[in-house]
């Protein structure tokens, strides 16, 4: 039974040209994390593998930094970065848990962070 839950940073906004940290946290399960994938829609941004460490997709190398922890830092944000981001936890023996974050990149300087919320 997949008992775990993923807590994410939820709906967040940030300023164009700035940076943002995407974070997920898996709880309420005894399962062991082997790999975490970060995806934007259908594009792979980065992988954090238990043995191999971090791999950032070549097309994002200049603007994506690993961490903190299993999170991901997006830098030099553009309006085109607005959209859905997914953290996909590959765990033993439960399988995959997926968390969703919606990022809005704003032109103005009034970007505010959304509240944290639970994804079952």
């Amino acid at each position: 039974m997949m008992t775990g839950t993923i807590e994410t940073t939820g709906n967040i906004s940030a300023e164009k040209g700035g940076s943002i940290i995407l974070q997920c946290h898996l709880s309420s399960t005894t399962a062991q994390v082997t790999q975490v994938n970060w995806e934007q829609q259908d594009q792979l941004l980065a992988i954090c593998n238990a043995d191999l460490g971090w791999h950032i997709s070549p097309s994002f190398k200049d603007r994506v930094a690993p961490g903190p922890g299993l999170g991901l830092t997006l830098q030099s944000l553009t309006v085109n970065d607005t959209g859905e981001y997914f953290c996909i936890y590959h765990t033993y023996p439960d399988g995959t848990y997926t968390g969703r974050i919606f990022l809005e990149v704003l032109e103005s300087s009034v970007a505010e962070h959304g509240a944290r919320f639970q994804i079952p």
Partner: antibody, heavy 119, light 109 residues
Framework: QVQLVQSGAEVKKPGASVKVSCKAS????????MNWVRQAPGQGLEWMGW????????TYAQKFQGRVTMTLDTSTSTAYMELSSLRSEDTAVYYC????????????WGQGTLVTVSS | QAVVTQEPSLTVSPGGTVTLTCGSS?????????ANWVQQKPGQAFRGLIR???GRGSGVPARFSGSLLGGKAALTISGAQPEDEAEYYC?????????FGGGTKLTVL
């Protein structure tokens, strides 16, 4: 390369306990779960449980609950499985196997430890 | 507890293709059962071939492939080699425990 090396064969009397070890090398021990599986002579495989090597939390198959204890020594990358109140039906080869969450399952296996229970 | 069933024995000619299946007494096998296939040769350690239905293990030849077929998990060996003669076990995950099948003895003849 990944290796799981188990302790040697044991002969035990009914009612006794046995402790089998599984020493891992070639990877970061605390990044992957460890399973214990047994195979009685001429029989199939039976899963006994697994232990989260990061938290140390074990999960036991219902059949072995109360009789099996799975532990770790992370300083030596070794997993242990202790089975108590042994009976003749526990005569089997006991295997450790690594649990991988990327494509869920057991990817590497130890060579096995024969435990014979006989009076 | 669920019962996992496999063909007791199968024979394939060298270079031929053979499919081993793995069924569940609880109904159709799905990706949630994370079907595993392991190979056992006499006097050798078990070798993990397939994990998570179709994930080939490290160093496992491409002739081994896993899938779901007609409500069962399947292991297909395309272009069987003499060294593929072995016992093959499948394992299915049922919420909180693994159950192994009885094994298939594959003969390459």
């Amino acid at each position: 390369q990944v290796q799981l090396v188990q302790s040697g064969a044991e002969v035990k009397k009914p009612g006794a306990s046995v402790k089998v070890s599984c020493k891992a090398s070639g990877y970061t021990f605390t990044n992957y779960g460890m399973n214990w599986v047994r195979q009685a002579p001429g029989q199939g495989l039976e899963w006994m449980g697994w232990i989260n090597t990061y938290t140390g939390e074990p999960t036991y198959a219902q059949k072995f609950q109360g009789r099996v204890t799975m532990t770790l020594d992370t300083s030596t990358s070794t997993a242990y499985m202790e089975l108590s109140s042994l009976r003749s039906e526990d005569t089997a080869v006991y295997y450790c196997s690594r649990g991988n969450g990327y494509y869920v399952g057991m990817d590497y296996w130890g060579q096995g430890t024969l435990v014979t229970v006989s009076s | 507890q669920a019962v996992v069933t496999q063909e007791p024995s199968l024979t394939v000619s060298p270079g031929g293709t053979v499919t081993l299946t793995c069924g569940s007494s609880t109904g159709a096998v799905t990706t949630s059962n994370h079907a595993n296939w392991v190979q056992q040769k006499p006097g050798q350690a078990f070798r993990g071939l397939i994990r998570g239905t179709n994930g080939r293990g490290s160093g496992v030849p491409a002739r081994f492939s896993g899938s779901l077929l007609g409500g069962k998990a399947a292991l297909t060996i395309s272009g069987a080699q003499p060294e593929d003669e072995a016992e093959y076990y499948c394992a299915l995950w049922f919420s909180n425990h693994w159950v192994f099948g009885g094994g298939t003895k594959l003969t390459v003849l």
